[in-house]
C-alpha cells in the first residue's frame, strides 16, 4: 500500500537506538577509534568491485583507500561504523558481500572485558610505608576522550595505589554520580578501579571524574564521554535479488528479497497488472497490485512463492521495502515457457509448501 516512488527521503533524525532487522547476518569487523582497518572483499572472480556504506556509494578519500579487493580505513572513527558491501560485477551477473564495521570503545580505557590484568593494578604496600594515592598504570588513562556508539558498554579505569589503600568515587560533570542518575545504573569494580556503564544513551554524555583518596592525599582524573548515535538508514536490498527466473506453465517458482534495515521494515511484493484491458486506472495511476505484504518478523515475508503458474503470471515482480526513513525496491522478471520447452539458464525453483502464494 505504501507509495511506489523511486525517490527516497533520508533526512530524518533518528528516534530510538535502532534494532537490526537483518535477514542475513553479515560478518562484523571491530576496530578501536584511531586504529586502521583492512577488509578484503570475499568474492571470487571479481573483475570490477564497487563499495557502499549504508547503501551509499563509497569512494576513496584521505582516510579510505580502495585497492583491488581491499578496503582500508585509516584512523577509524565511530562514524565509520555501518553496513558495508562490496559488489563484484561480472560479465553475466553480479554478487554482493555484506559486512558490518563497528568502531567502538566497547570496553573503554584500553581494557578487555575480563580485566585479566586487574590484579596488577591492586598494589599491596608495606604497612609501615605510608603513601598518598598515585596512579599505577597511566597508559590506561591516556585516552581522555571516548566516543562510543549508543547501546555499547563503556568502562573507565583509574588504576591506583597508596597506603592505606585509597578509596575511589566517581563524579559526573563535577557532581556526585548516583545510581539513579542513569537508567540501569552503573557498576563500580573497586578491585579493578573501574566504572562500567552498559548500553549507553545520549544522556550519558559528559565528564566522568574518578577521585582516589586516602588520609594522605587525593588525586583525580577526568574522562569525557561522547555517545554517538548511528543514524538509521532506509532499507538496503541485497544486490542481485530478487533474481530473474523462468519456469514452464504449471510450474512453481519463488523470488527472494534480502533486506538490511535499522528501523523496522515492511516488505511488499508488487506486480504490474491490467484491469479491464488497461494498465492504468481512470485516475491515471498505474495498476500496481500488492500480491503480498508483511512486516519482516512475519514468516517468509522475504519470499514470494508462485504455484502452478500460467502465462499470465509472466512479467516483472517488484520487492519494495520501506521503513519510516525511506524505501528501496528491486525487481526481477518471470518468464513462463510453454509446457514442452524446458527452462533455460535460470532454472526452475521448486517452492516450499510453507509459502502462501
Amino acid at each position: 500500500r505504501p507509495s511506489f516512488s523511486l525517490v527516497e527521503d533520508t533526512t530524518l533524525e533518528p528516534e530510538e537506538p535502532p534494532t537490526k532487522y537483518q535477514i542475513s547476518q553479515p560478518e562484523v569487523y571491530v576496530a578501536a577509534p584511531g586504529e586502521s582497518l583492512e577488509v578484503r572483499c570475499l568474492l571470487k572472480d571479481a573483475a570490477v568491485i564497487s563499495w557502499t556504506k549504508d547503501g551509499v556509494h563509497l569512494g576513496p578519500n584521505n582516510r579510505t583507500v580502495l585497492i583491488g579487493e581491499y578496503l582500508q580505513i585509516k584512523g577509524a572513527t565511530p562514524r565509520d561504523s555501518g553496513l558495508y558491501a562490496c559488489t563484484a560485477s561480472r560479465t553475466v551477473d553480479s554478487e554482493t558481500w555484506y559486512f558490518m564495521v563497528n568502531v567502538t570503545d566497547a570496553i573503554s580505557s584500553g581494557d578487555d572485558e575480563d580485566d585479566t590484568d586487574g590484579a596488577e593494578d591492586f598494589v599491596s604496600e608495606n604497612s609501615n610505608n605510608k603513601r598518598a594515592p598515585y596512579w599505577t598504570n597511566t597508559e590506561k588513562m591516556e585516552k581522555r576522550l571516548h566516543a562510543v556508539p549508543a547501546a555499547n558498554t563503556v568502562k573507565f579505569r583509574c588504576p591506583a595505589g597508596g597506603n592505606p589503600m585509597p578509596t575511589m568515587r566517581w563524579l559526573k560533570n563535577g557532581k556526585e554520580f548516583k545510581q539513579e542518575h542513569r537508567i540501569g545504573g552503573y557498576k563500580v569494580r573497586n578491585q579493578h578501579w573501574s566504572l562500567i556503564m552498559e548500553s549507553v544513551v545520549p544522556s550519558d554524555k559528559g565528564n566522568y571524574t574518578c577521585v582516589v583518596e586516602n588520609e594522605y592525599g587525593s588525586i583525580n582524573h577526568t574522562y569525557h564521554l561522547d555517545v554517538v548515535e548511528r543514524s538509521p538508514h532506509r532499507p538496503i536490498l541485497q544486490a542481485g535479488l530478487p533474481a530473474n527466473a523462468s519456469t514452464v506453465v504449471g510450474g512453481d517458482v519463488e523470488f527472494v528479497c534480502k533486506v538490511y534495515s535499522d528501523a523496522q521494515p515492511h516488505i511488499q511484493w508488487i506486480k504490474h497488472v491490467e484491469k479491464n484491458g488497461s494498465k492504468y486506472g481512470p485516475d491515471g495511476l498505474p495498476y500496481l497490485k500488492v500480491l503480498k505484504h508483511s512486516g519482516i518478523n512475519s514468516s517468509n515475508a522475504e519470499v514470494l512463492a508462485l504455484f502452478n503458474v500460467t502465462e499470465a503470471d509472466a512479467g516483472e515482480y517488484i520487492c519494495k521495502v520501506s521503513n519510516y526513513i525511506g524505501q528501496a525496491n528491486q525487481s526481477a522478471w518471470l518468464t513462463v515457457l510453454p509446457k514442452q520447452q524446458a527452462p533455460g539458464r535460470e532454472k526452475e525453483i521448486t517452492a516450499s509448501p510453507d509459502y502462501l502464494e
Epitope: 500500500r1 505504501p2 507509495s3 511506489f4 516512488s5 525517490v7 527521503d9 530524518l12 515492511h266 511488499q268 508488487i270 486506472g281 485516475d283 495511476l285 498505474p286 495498476y287 500496481l288 497490485k289 500488492v290 503480498k292 505484504h293 508483511s294 512486516g295 512475519s298 520501506s322 521503513n323 519510516y324 526513513i325 525511506g326 502462501l356 502464494e357
Partner: antibody
Amino acid sequence: EVQLQQSGPELVKPGASVKISCKASGYTFSDSYMNWVKQSHGKSLEWIGDINCNHGGTSYNQKFRDKATLTVDKSSSTVYMELRSLSSEDSAVYYCVRWDGFLYHSMDSWGQGTSVTVSS
Amino acid sequence: DIVMTQSHKLMSTSLGDRVSITCKASHNVDTAVAWYQQKPGQSPSLLIYWASTRHTGVPDRFTGSGSGTDFTLTINNVQSEDLADYFCHQYNTYPLTFGGGTKLEIK
C-alpha cells in the same frame, strides 16, 4: 456496489474473547485485502491489521499483535476478527474496511461498524 | 510509527465559505495520504486518495493537495451536509496511521 455487512453489537466481560464478522459482497472478494480499524470514544482511528482475502496472509499493527487474530472464509466471503483478553480499553467500534490491493489506492469501503462493550 | 497531526480539532465556518483542513506527517509519506469524512452516527467514507485524487462520486468542491509531510483538504462553497469529522490517513509506511480528526461546524 461494494457492501460490507458486520455482525451486531457485543457486550462482553473483562478477560473474555469475542469474534466479530464482516461479510463482503458486490466485488471480487479474493482480489482484495480486508483491514480492521478501531474507533474509540467516537474519535480517533487506529489500524489493527489486514488480511489477504485470497491466501489469508496477515499483517498486524504491533500494538494489536497479541490482541487480535484475523481469519478469512473464502467460501462465504467473510472475514473474522477475534479479540482476546478483553479489558475496558478494548471498548470501541470496530470497522472492517476494504482495500483493493492496488498500491496507490487507499482503503475505500467501510462496514457499518460493530460496537464492542467490555463491562463486568 | 508515523504520526499524523491535525492541529485544529475544531474548525468553524459559514455556509458557502471555503475552509482548509491541514494535516502534518512526522516523516515523509510521499503522496500516500487519504482523507475520510465521518458524519455523526455513520462510518467514515473516502473522499481523497493519493493526496489529490477524488474518489468516485465525491463532489468537486473537495480538493486535496500536498506531498511529503504537509497536506491540506480544501472544501469550497461549504454545504450543510459537509458538517462532519475529517480524518487524514497515511498509507505510505506500516503501520497505517490516522490523524486525530478535525470537526467542521457552522459558526
